[in-house]
């Protein structure tokens, strides 16, 4: 069962001092939503017992395995059902505490009732404040039964539930008709899924015989021990004030476990701690009684004395629950209550016994759950004991369960049952995950979901080049850390597999499925440098670079040019996909911008060192286009262009540029500067006769502006072939006839 305890502090003079604490003894309990499981939850369950809303309760976590609920402001806040949930996965367990108001009309004689399937359960509600009305019984909040108020027997109302079945489990309440629900007596009925002394799916297995009030769990056959007792069969008492499956927890406060109610996983329910009884667990056991709720009677023999926490304390020469066994009777010594082995191992189990006459090898035997008896292969005889060693055949899952070591001599016999847990070594269900890769190393996350049993003690990563027959390389790592595989070959596929191990001999599981992980290319090592750059327009930049000369092939796939615009905080990246390229034209840049420029060689996804940066200022954008451009042929070799100045100029024009191109021609256009910016007319000379030309123009201030519209005009015919167009400018007001 899960080691989970819900403690209720019942010192009820002041509700504000009331608290509930949930303590988990599970490994890694409550650490949050990490690989080891969800946190402890502690809450009031208002589904069945609804109380008036109040301020929210305060939840405080104390370390990883304890959570406390406080903030109760009035007694009615306490009444009802509280639950703590702990454990991970299939072991997730809910522990329930039912709190009754001490001032209620009806009080339960006993809150928790654990019964076996088919038993008759009797719930008894004691009259605390009489009302002369019917008593209504409810089950899980729904009407169940009515009793007339005259039906009280010795001041108690009894509800008999014959032949109970597991679905009968739940919260029962007894309330006087029309009384407040807070004045009800609340009970918890737990019905085990099997008849007395049985457990398992078909109730075919026999319980180990839980001692000291322990209750056999109907699913796994384990004893859920009362607070203050431990061992497979709850045979061992904890020291006073301690609880938990291994007596590892200590009751808070100076008065130990006084005033505390302990709730444990079903089918145990709740009780006072060992040595205490009463509705508020504040009364010490009467003489001759001990244990949780003082339910056990000592009946010590042979001079034994009764300790209210642990039972009979035997004088020298006697042992046993009632000091009924003489030390002459053989006795099994120091047998572990629980042992764990891995599947298919062949462990050695030791069993030591003492007695008079002295036990010999043949007098000690080991019995498996299926009834098979093993005889010891070796015995070590010492002055005070004989230790028999048993070689166990290869373990199978069916070997899980209660084993028994038995010693028999002419002085009598003794036996000790112990639990053997056969665990399945873990096998990864998935391949490891690649986190990052470089040319010579892979970083891998090895911990994956697995079948079989934890905890994971070691993780082995096996790897070798793909399609290789060479031996696997192995690295052993911590389960919670990522692994770096080093000294690998670049641009190589590796087959990688995980192997998990759990503690103990034979804990290594089978290898998990393989996955292919490929190392990156070698990093490019050459550092380019920028040879030069020139502006080819307000938004265009031509860049050139060089590489150092080195012997051997160039390690690289291309170049990455980076332009950083510091003003806007923007980076522009340009990929040049040829490693032979040494120049690139960058277009679409922002005019008037300061750029920092560098270049670096790349190979696969890896970048080499960047060149020393250069700083480039692009000229600002130019002026708007000239308006109303018009062309007029003057002769067979001259055409006059007229225009109007651009509007909304950002500054004085430095020149105009005219573009001349033969219509339909394939050659490059000719650009002609008009260096007198005040001109609004120019004559283009040296044109070919009877030829159709296209003209457009733009202005320049610090940078070239936008092109005007394109105009078309033909020279007049019958002229000679000209040498090429030239221009002559005049101010428009001079006229064409001068």
């Amino acid at each position: 069962a899960v080691d989970l305890t819900l403690l209720a502090n019942l010192r009820l003079t002041d509700p504000q001092r009331f608290f509930l604490t949930c303590v988990s003894g599970e490994a890694g309990a409550g650490r949050g939503s990490d690989a080891w499981g969800p946190p402890l939850l502690l809450e009031k369950d208002d589904r069945i017992v609804r109380t008036p809303p109040g301020p929210p309760l305060r939840l405080a976590r104390n370390g990883s395995h304890q959570v406390t609920l406080r903030g109760f402001s009035k007694p009615s806040d306490l009444v009802g059902v509280f639950s703590c949930v702990g454990g991970a996965g299939a072991r997730r367990t809910r522990v329930i505490y039912v709190h009754n108001s001490p001032g209620a009309h009806l009080l339960p004689d006993k809150v928790t009732h654990t019964v076996n399937k088919g038993d008759t359960a009797v719930l008894s509600a004691r009259v605390h404040k009489e009302k002369q009305t019917d008593v209504i019984w409810k089950s899980n909040g729904s009407y169940f039964y009515t009793l007339d108020w005259h039906e009280a027997q010795d001041g108690r109302f009894l509800l008999q539930l014959p032949n109970v079945q597991p679905p009968s489990s739940g919260i029962y309440s007894a309330t006087y008709l029309e009384a407040s629900p807070l004045g009800s007596a609340f009970f918890r009925l737990i019905v085990r899924g099997c008849g007395a002394g049985r457990w398992g799916p078909g109730c075919t297995k026999e319980c180990p015989g839980c001692l000291h009030g322990g209750v056999c769990h109907d699913h796994d056959g384990e004893c859920v021990c009362p607070p203050g007792f431990t061992g497979t069969r709850c045979e061992q008492a904890c020291r006073e004030g301690r609880f938990g499956q291994s007596c590892q927890e200590q009751c808070p406060g100076i008065s130990g476990c006084r005033g505390l109610t302990f709730c444990l996983p079903d089918p145990y329910g709740c009780s006072c701690g060992s040595g205490w009884r009463g509705s508020q667990c504040q009364e010490a056991c009467a003489p001759g009684h001990f244990g949780a709720d003082c339910r056990l009677q000592c009946q010590c023999q042979n001079g034994g004395t009764c300790d209210r926490f642990s039972g009979c304390v035997c004088p020298s020469g006697w042992h046993g629950v009632h000091c009924e066994k003489s030390d002459r009777i053989p006795q099994i010594l120091n047998m572990a209550s629980e042992l764990e082995f891995n599947l298919e191992t062949m462990p050695r189990i030791n069993c030591a016994a003492a007695g008079n006459p002295f036990p010999v090898r043949g007098s000690i035997e080991l019995r498996k759950p299926d009834g098979t008896v093993l005889l010891s292969t070796k015995a070590i005889v010492e002055p005070e004991k004989t230790t028999a060693e048993f070689e166990v055949p290869r373990l199978v899952l069916a070997d899980s369960g209660f084993w028994e070591c038995r010693v028999s001599t002419s002085g009598g016999q003794d036996s000790r049952r112990f639990k053997v847990n056969v665990k399945v070594p873990p096998v990864p269900l998935a391949a490891p995950r690649l986190l990052t890769k470089q040319s010579r190393q892979l970083v891998v996350s090895p911990l994956v979901s697995f079948s079989g049993d934890g905890p994971i003690s070691t993780v082995r990563l096996h790897y070798r080049p793909q399609d290789s027959t060479m031996d696997w390389s192995t690295i052993v790592v911590d389960p919670s850390e990522n692994v770096t595989l080093m000294n690998l070959r670049p641009k190589t596929g590796y087959s990688v597999r995980v192997q998990l191990s759990r503690p103990g001999e034979g804990g290594e599981g089978a290898w998990g499925p393989p996955t292919l992980m490929t190392t990156d290319c070698p990093e490019p090592l050459l550092q380019p440098w920028l040879e030069g750059w020139h502006v080819e327009g307000t938004d265009r930049l031509r860049v050139s670079w060089s590489l150092p000369l080195v012997p051997g092939p160039l390690v690289g796939d291309g170049f990455l040019l980076r332009l950083w615009d510091g003003t806007r905080g923007q980076e522009r990246r340009e990929n040049v996909s040829s490693p032979q390229a040494r120049t690139a034209l960058l277009t679409g840049l922002t005019p008037g911008t300061h750029y920092q420029l560098d270049v670096q060689l790349y190979h696969c996804t890896l970048l080499g060192p960047a060149s020393p940066p250069a700083h480039v200022l692009l000229p600002p954008s130019g002026p708007p286009a000239p308006r109303h451009l018009h062309a007029q042929a003057l002769s067979d070799s001259e055409i006059q262009l007229t225009w109007k100045h651009p509007e909304a100029l950002p500054g004085p024009i430095s020149k105009y540029v005219v573009e001349v191109q033969v219509a339909g021609g394939a050659g490059d256009p000719l650009w002609i500067d008009v260096d007198r910016p005040e001109e609004t007319s120019t004559i283009i000379r040296g044109l070919n006769a009877s030829t159709r030309y296209l003209f457009r123009m733009r202005a320049s201030i610090q940078g070239l502006g936008d092109w005007s519209n394109t105009v078309e005009e033909s020279t007049l015919g019958n002229g000679l072939q000209a040498e090429g167009p030239v221009q002559e400018s005049r101010a428009a007001e001079e006229g064409l006839d001068q």
Epitope: Y145, T146, D148, W149, L177
Partner: antibody
């Protein structure tokens, strides 16, 4: 569906006897109080008797005390009313009703008892 | 026999609210919050419409509401409708573990 069905009514002479039955279905009969309530022609409702789930506790209206006996058979899910020494004023429609805490829900459709010579 | 006192008849126009009173003693109405109200159509069995003074069973119109002050309980029918023209009875648990009904009220919709 919770259902109650009365039977056994009829014409009976003064001083005579009659046994009414009420068959219950659709609920756990053995867990509830059961009542008989009657209504004389053109008159109001009159509570007659109650029996507790165990059958051990019964109460009667003063007008029928000593003459009527309420009983139940939880194994048969049936409620009974044994009426002896009947009088003309016992003429009424007799209803059985399930008692949930302090009220009646549901009711049967009723059976008519006529006491007349 | 005990009898709780109800008016023999109460009338109201459609859409109006009417209230039916039910007066008992401190051993019944005044002693417990266990007053219930029943509606009865002619020739039919009574039907529970209010329990524990003011609670409505599921399926009962919210035009019906109940209250109690001292030894007198009341049933209010708001937004009176033609189909409300039937008989209404109050009932109460008593200190002797018996039950008692009112004399009944005939509601008329004008």
């Amino acid at each position: 569906e919770v259902q109650l069905l009365e039977s056994g009514g009829g014409l009976v002479q003064p001083g005579g006897s009659l046994r009414l039955s009420c068959a219950a279905s659709g609920f756990t009969f053995s867990a509830y109080k059961m009542h008989w309530v009657r209504q004389a022609p053109g008159k109001g409702l009159e509570w007659v008797s109650v029996i507790y789930p165990s059958g051990g506790w019964t109460y009667y209206a003063d007008s029928v005390k000593g003459r009527f006996t309420i009983s139940r058979d939880n194994s048969k899910n049936t409620l009974y009313l044994q009426m002896n020494s009947l009088r003309a004023e016992d003429t009424a429609v007799y209803y059985c009703a399930r008692g949930t805490a302090g009220w009646f829900d549901p009711w049967g459709q009723g059976t008519l008892v006529t006491v007349s010579s | 026999q005990y009898e709780l006192t109800q008016p023999a008849s109460v009338s109201g126009s459609p859409g109006q609210s009417i209230t039916i009173s039910c007066t008992g003693t401190n051993t019944d109405v005044g002693g417990y919050n266990l007053v219930s109200w029943y509606q009865q159509h002619p020739g039919k069995a009574p039907k529970l419409i209010i329990y524990e003074v003011s609670n409505r069973p599921s399926g009962v119109s919210n035009r019906f509401s109940g209250s109690k002050s001292g030894n007198t309980a009341s049933l209010t029918i708001s937004g009176l409708q033609a189909e409300d023209e039937v008989d209404y009875y109050c009932g109460s648990y008593t200190s002797s573990s018996t039950h008692v009904f009112g004399s009944g009220t005939k509601v008329t919709v004008l």
